[in-house]
Interface confidence: low
């Protein structure tokens, strides 16, 4: 049978039998958060041989091996990966080896095994083996092989059973556990697949086969799968699906996208039958299942449920990509980024009409509009307040807007705003308003003759915070509401907040002319009512972090010297509330005497306040079956137990502890002091960690259903 | 022809239990969950449960949790409902109704509707 | 719950002209997927419901493009040009994204 369109198993072990039929899972498989220890023994699945996308195993409580569950599963295809992993182990606290000892293939993606405190058997299985490339694997955090002990079949008897390979400069038995040797194929068979009794399978077959040389026996498919037999191709009138099978017309015809929004089933292309058009293509008619080319670029109408599309990064331009008409409003507030005008060309690119408004504010990152490539019409069905439909306001290193000389852009309807663009000519905005019709619209201060194009502004009115309330990840401020000599030249607030660990932060930190700046910036509008205080809720913010907060007004009377009037406060220093702290981290115990554990720890990666105390507790637990499998009084086969670096020493440490011999002499001495590159390498290494971490947690924590 | 036939009306007693049918025909059993429906005397509609007839797995509304329990017969493509500890107020029409199954997210929907079974509930 | 509020309760109509059918959620009803999976049926007396709109404004297979859907985040709307005697009868709108799923309370369409 096969299960899909992807299995996801958590909180109840019993799930697990929604597997008892299936022989492939076209699709992923997550087996996580069992937190509960549970009995697997009496759970086996020997039909499963072949995952068409990968495998996550993610904090599965008393699962000591996967060898039991899945004695059979051969092929993990990486059709669709996790985070560029076909094969996830993460955090499995009681996984002793993964023992799958007839995986033979992972056809695309690495591996990751992570965080597995008691997880040996890692060291004895060579993956070069099951994977083209070995390089983007990633195994850390797992048991110290020099506590695991792990032997291969037979070699304690002095008659090893298992074959040897060279996996950096060592040349040892490969093994999944303690009874499972790594299955390998007679070299007389090349890049094919083997069966149990070392003869050759058919070219087709991919990982195994029940018998030689014959496409109808193999265990998987190298390429694709058809009526019982594995073709390199699929035969007329059937499409590839999935990445490994072929179907034929109607059963394309009757599936439907579970991730595409549209509203039309599958399409049939290229002999492939996919979920929607590939790029440069369109359905042929809206019930069609056929794709034709477009002519130019597609032409795909996006629609902002908000109406408004703020675009603040390059993931916020993603969700733009191939969009020819954009129903709604445009507002763009890119402050910072990398390479950011090539990301947005990239993603905003196509984009020929806008139907509302398009407001550019705060992009302190971009030099000039020209992203915006094929804009040729700004409809204006929607306007801002005072009648605009171009907004251009406080870009502080725009210096171009289009290249008039190569473009055509009409605003049908609206008006113009431009201010506080200090490195914008006016020149460049009168030709604007010449090619784009507006001459003649724009009222006296829409384009402010002395603050675009003029660096030259100064602020000389203190603005006073009058409360702030906190929690753990929330700011409330409030602050005197500012009156200009004329109310009407009051534009709006600007609150800047940033994290500040110590007082010493300035209004200019981490500005430049390459767009990057330090300060979060929020825009607050005017309260309605003249006598309410203007204030603001900051969320999404560190429990038990220091933030520093100013804000501006922003104003257009002029004072004598024609510098522009406005307002601003002292930086503030505020914290928000602390926080329950996350958990303690490497844990690690160790007995001293028949009575006694010593248990060890690390304080948490976030403690979100000032740890008082710690609680520790502990229980029984049965004696583990595992430690019984070995022979410990055969001589020198078991390494001696010692801790990893980083773990602990029953005694404590009263000297300079003893490591690597330095320099010139020998004796003991200190460890040599990383290097700047070490340290960054490790620094950049954290960094992959939590991200991949993130990604993990973001994927697989769903709210609870209702 | 796409068809889901349901078993007949059923009177039954307060405190009793009765268990529904829905035959499933025209299409594979398989690629939809089966859910139902209930529908009291000149009252609206409420959805009550489903089943992934691949699996077994279930979905129920917390209201009729412990008064419904599904099942299914792959071999006969035949989804059952049960309903325990009757009183009048579960007399009512009760409906089997489809929802694709795979690569469902587009057209998740009920386009197919059983007959209806009337179960009335009286001493 | 979600609850799904219809207006209104009855609605009668003469042949030909237009109806309008509103129906409001008591949260969004978009799912995490990114669809609203809002639907309207109709059931006539003695029959099983039928489905017209799935996906707030996508028309099921045979169902004549007199029938309009339309709305985004709680609110939304059925409407029916040029009413015909077959169109007559319960009007439910029905919420698919969160569980449980809900129905609207109806609205009983019929000539005045």
């Known amino acids: 049978e096969i299960c899909g369109p992807g299995i996801d198993i958590r909180n109840d072990y019993q799930q697990l039998k929604r597997l008892e039929n299936c022989t492939v899972i076209e699709g992923y498989l997550h087996i996580l958060l069992i937190s509960k220890a549970e009995d697997y023994r009496s759970y086996r699945f020997p039909k499963l041989t072949v995952i068409t996308e990968y495998l996550l195993l993610f904090r599965v409580a008393g699962l000591e091996s996967l060898g039991d569950l899945f004695p059979n599963l051969t092929v993990i295809r990486g059709w669709k990966l996790f985070y560029n992993y076909a094969l996830v182990i993460f955090e499995m606290t009681n996984l002793k080896d993964i023992g799958l000892y007839n995986l033979r293939n992972i056809t695309r993606g690495a591996i990751r095994i992570e965080k597995n405190a008691d997880l040996c058997y890692l060291s004895t299985v060579d993956w070069s083996l099951i994977l083209d490339a070995v390089s983007n694997n990633y195994i850390v955090g797992n048991k110290p092989p020099k506590e695991c002990g792990d032997l291969c079949p037979g070699t304690m008897e002095e008659k090893p059973m298992c074959e040897k390979t060279t996996i950096n400069n060592e040349y040892n038995y490969r093994c999944w556990t303690t009874n499972r040797c790594q299955k390998m194929c007679p070299s007389t068979c090349g890049k094919r697949a083997c069966t149990e009794n070392n003869e050759c399978c058919h070219p087709e077959c991919l990982g195994s086969c029940s018998a030689p040389d014959n496409d109808t026996a193999c265990v998987a498919c190298r390429h694709y799968y058809y009526a019982g037999v594995c073709v390199p191709a699929c035969p007329p009138n059937t499409y590839r699906f999935e990445g490994w099978r072929c179907v034929d017309r109607d059963f394309c015809a009757n599936i439907l996208s579970a991730e595409s929004s549209d509203s039309e089933g599958f399409v049939i292309h290229d002999g492939e039958c996919m979920q929607e058009c590939p790029s440069g293509f369109i359905r042929n008619g809206s019930q069609s299942m056929y794709c034709i080319p477009c002519e130019g670029p597609c032409p795909k109408v996006c629609e902002e449920e908000k109406k408004t599309k703020t675009i603040d990064s390059v993931t916020s331009a993603q969700m733009l990509q191939g969009c020819t008409i954009f129903k709604g409003n445009l507002l763009i507030n890119i402050r910072r980024g990398n390479n950011i005008a090539s990301e947005l060309e990239n993603f905003m690119g196509l984009i020929e009409v806008v139907t509302g408004y398009v407001k550019i504010r705060h992009s302190h990152a971009l030099v000039s509009l020209s992203f915006l490539k094929n804009l040729r019409l700004i409809l204006g069905e929607e306007q801002l307040e005072g009648n605009y439909s171009f907004y251009v306001l406080d870009n502080q290193n725009l210096q171009q807007l289009w290249d008039w000389d190569h473009r055509n852009l009409t605003i049908k309807a609206g008006k113009m705003y431009f201010a506080f663009n200090p490195k914008l000519c006016v020149s460049e905005i009168y030709r604007m308003e010449e090619v784009t019709g507006t001459k003649g619209r724009q009222s006296k201060g829409d384009i402010n003759t002395r603050n675009n194009g003029e660096r030259a502004s100064c602020e000389s009115d203190v603005l006073h915070f009058t409360s702030t309330t906190t929690s753990k990840n929330r700011i409330i401020i409030t602050w005197h509401r500012y009156r200009p000599p004329d109310y009407r030249d009051l534009i709006s607030f600007t609150v800047y907040y940033k994290e500040a660990p110590f007082k010493n932060v300035t209004e200019y930190d981490g500005q430049d002319a390459c767009g990057s700046n330090s300060w979060n910036m929020v825009d607050v509008d005017l309260p309605p009512n003249k006598d309410v205080e203007p204030g603001i809720l900051l969320h999404g913010l560190k429990p038990w972090t220091q933030y520093a907060v100013y804000v501006k007004a922003v104003t257009l009377t002029m004072v004598e010297n024609d510098h522009i009037r406005g307002a601003k406060s002292e930086i503030l220093y505020i914290r928000t509330n602390a926080s329950v702290p996350s958990i303690p981290l490497d844990v690690l115990s160790a007995s001293n005497s028949s009575s006694q554990l010593i248990v060890k720890w690390n304080p948490p990666s976030l403690p979100n306040g000032n740890l008082s105390y710690y609680i520790v507790r502990w229980q029984r637990q049965p004696q583990d079956g595992y430690l019984y499998r070995h022979n410990y009084c055969s001589k020198d086969k078991i390494p001696i137990r010692k801790y990893a670096d980083g773990t602990i020493d029953i005694e404590e440490v009263t000297e300079n502890p003893k490591t690597e011999v330095c320099g010139g002499e020998k004796g003991p001495c200190c460890a040599c002091p990383k290097t700047e590159a070490e340290k960054q390498a490790e620094k950049e290494e954290a960094e992959y960690r939590k991200v991949f971490e993130n990604f993990l947690h973001n994927s697989i924590f769903v709210p609870r259903p209702e | 022809e796409v068809q889901l036939q349901q078993s007949g009306p059923e009177l039954v007693k307060p405190g009793a239990s009765v268990k529904i049918s829905c035959k499933a025909s025209?299409?594979?059993?398989?690629?939809?969950?089966m859910n139902w429906v209930k529908q009291s005397h000149g009252k609206s509609l409420e959805w009550m449960a489903n089943?992934?007839?691949?699996?077994?797995?279930?979905n129920y509304n917390q209201k009729f949790t412990g008064k419904a329990t599904l099942t299914v017969d792959k071999s006969s493509t035949t989804a059952y409902m049960e309903l325990r500890s009757l009183t009048s107020e579960d007399s009512a029409v009760y409906y089997c109704?489809?929802?694709?199954?795979?690569?469902?997210?587009?057209?998740?929907?009920?386009?197919?509707w059983g007959t209806g079974t009337t179960v009335t509930v009286s001493s | 719950d979600v609850l799904m509020t219809q207006t209104p309760l009855s609605l009668p109509v003469s042949l030909g002209d237009q109806a309008s059918i509103s129906c409001r959620s008591s949260q969004t009803i978009v799912h995490s997927n990114g669809n609203t999976y809002l639907e309207w049926y109709l059931q006539k007396p003695g029959q099983s419901p039928k489905l017209l709109i799935y996906?707030?404004?996508y028309r099921f297979s045979g169902v004549p493009d007199r029938f309009s859907g339309s709305g985004s985040g709680t609110d939304f709307t059925l409407k029916i040009s040029r009413l015909e005697a077959e169109d007559l009868g319960i009007y439910y709108c029905?919420?698919?994204?969160?569980?449980?799923?809900?129905f609207g309370g109806g609205t009983k369409l019929e000539i005045k």
């Open positions: 996906r707030v404004s």
């Open positions: 025209g299409y594979a059993f398989t690629d939809y969950y």
């Open positions: 029905f919420q698919g994204s969160h569980v449980p799923y809900t």
């Open positions: 089943i992934n007839p691949n699996t077994g797995g279930t």
């Open positions: 109704t489809r929802w694709i199954l795979y690569y469902g997210s587009s057209k998740w929907y009920f386009d197919v």
